[in-house]
C-alpha cells in the first residue's frame, strides 16, 4: 500500500544530482511503490514517473484528480489520476478535464451556454476574476472570466480553495463544497487519523490558518481517544 508514502512527504529515489549531493551522502530522498490497478498490472513508470499520493484534488496537477486507483479501493490510499475526458463517467466536477464538468455522472463541456444554466442558481460570485492559471494551463474550474468577477465569498459554491476569497477555503458542506473561513487560533479543528479519511465528512472544516496547527487541546489529554478535542494552536 501507499500508507508509508501518505504518512511521509519525503521524496526519495531521485536521479542525480538532486538525489544526494556531495557532502550529504544520506540525502537520497522514497517514491511511491508501484500501484496495483485492476487486472493486477503494476503501475508502469514512464521516465521514472511515480504516482503522487494525495488527500485532495487540489494537491494534484491541473489535469488530475485525487482518488483511489482501484475501484472500491482503500479510501486511505489515494493518488493523483489523469482527469476524465468528455463523455467519460464521473462522480464530481474535479474528475473531468479542464473545460468540462460532471453532469449526471458524465463529463460534459462547460462552455458558457451549458454551464451557466446548470449552476447559476446555486453559485453567487463563486469564482475568481481570471481563470487562466499563472502557468498558462486552464484550470478545471474555468467557466469564463466574463461570468464571475470576484473570488467566492463565505457560503459561495466552489470546487477548490483558490476559488475562494482570502481567508476562506473550499470545504465540503452536505454534498457540495462551499467557501468557509480558515480556522483561527483556539477554534476546533479536525485531525484526521489517516490521510483520506476526510472524504467521509459531510461538514468539512477548513484547515488552521498561517502559523497554526491542529493539536489536542491541552486539558483534553486525559480524555478518551474518541472525545479528544483538537484546536488550532500556535506552532
Amino acid at each position: 500500500t501507499l500508507n508509508s508514502v501518505l504518512n511521509s512527504n519525503a521524496i526519495k529515489n531521485l536521479p542525480p544530482p538532486l538525489g544526494g549531493a556531495a557532502g550529504h551522502p544520506g540525502s537520497a530522498v522514497s517514491a511511491a511503490p508501484g500501484i496495483l490497478y485492476p487486472g493486477g498490472n503494476k503501475y508502469q513508470t514512464i521516465d521514472n514517473y511515480q504516482p503522487y499520493p494525495c488527500a485532495e484534488d487540489e494537491e494534484c496537477g491541473t489535469d488530475e484528480y485525487c482518488a483511489s486507483p482501484t475501484r472500491g479501493g482503500d479510501a486511505g490510499v489515494q493518488i493523483c489520476l489523469a482527469c476524465r475526458k468528455r463523455r467519460k463517467r464521473c462522480m464530481r466536477h474535479a474528475m473531468c478535464c479542464p473545460g468540462n464538468y460532471c453532469k449526471n455522472g458524465i463529463c460534459v463541456s462547460s462552455d458558457q451556454n451549458h454551464f451557466r444554466g446548470e449552476i447559476e442558481e446555486t453559485i453567487t460570485e463563486s469564482f475568481g476574476n481570471d481563470h487562466s492559471t499563472l502557468d498558462g494551463y486552464s484550470r478545471r474550474t474555468t467557466l469564463s472570466s466574463k461570468m464571475y468577477h470576484t473570488k467566492g465569498q463565505e457560503g459561495s459554491v466552489c470546487l477548490r480553495s483558490s476559488d475562494c476569497a482570502s481567508g476562506l477555503c473550499c470545504a465540503r458542506h452536505f454534498w457540495s463544497k462551499i467557501c468557509k473561513p480558515v480556522l483561527k487560533e483556539g477554534q476546533v479543528c479536525t485531525k484526521h487519523r489517516r490521510k483520506g479519511s476526510h472524504g467521509l465528512e459531510i461538514f468539512q472544516r477548513c484547515y488552521c490558518g498561517e502559523g497554526l496547527s491542529c493539536r489536542i487541546q491541552k486539558d483534553h489529554h486525559q480524555a478518551s481517544n474518541s472525545s479528544r478535542l483538537h484546536t488550532c494552536q500556535r506552532h
Epitope: 511511491a32 487540489e58 502557468d135 494551463y137 483558490s162
Partner: nanobody
Framework: KVQLVESGGGLVQAGDSLTLSCTAS????????MGWFPQAPGKEREFVAA????????HYADYVKGRFAISRDNAKNTVLLQMSSLKPEDTAVYYC??????????????????????WGQGTQVTVSS
Amino acid sequence: KVQLVESGGGLVQAGDSLTLSCTASGRTFDNYAMGWFPQAPGKEREFVAAISWSLSRTHYADYVKGRFAISRDNAKNTVLLQMSSLKPEDTAVYYCAAAPRPKRISVSYFSTTSNYDYWGQGTQVTVSS
C-alpha cells in the same frame, strides 16, 4: 517584472538556528510551488524543501527532515525556511524558486530544479564549527 528576493542568511555556529525568507513580487504565487535549493561551492544546486500550492503539502530531502521547516504566507507572498541544528555541511548559497502547478504531477516534481521557472539571487548561509 517577477522577482524573488531572499534574505536572512548569515554566519552562524554549528547547532544554531536561522530563518530564511523569500519575498515574491510582480505576480501572485498562490498557484506555484515554492522551494529552497542550496548550492555549495563547486557543487550542483540541490533540493532541500518545497511547499506546494496546496498549503498542507511540504516536501523535504531526507537529510534535513526534522531540522528544516518550510512555510508560506500567500497574503504576503512570502516563503520561510526555518533551519535548526545547523551543520557545517549546510553551508551554501540558498536559492528560493517557484514552480508552476503542472498538468500532471509525480513524486519527484518538487525536487526537480528544471520544474522551477523563477529563481532568486540567493542568500549565503555559512555554518562554522
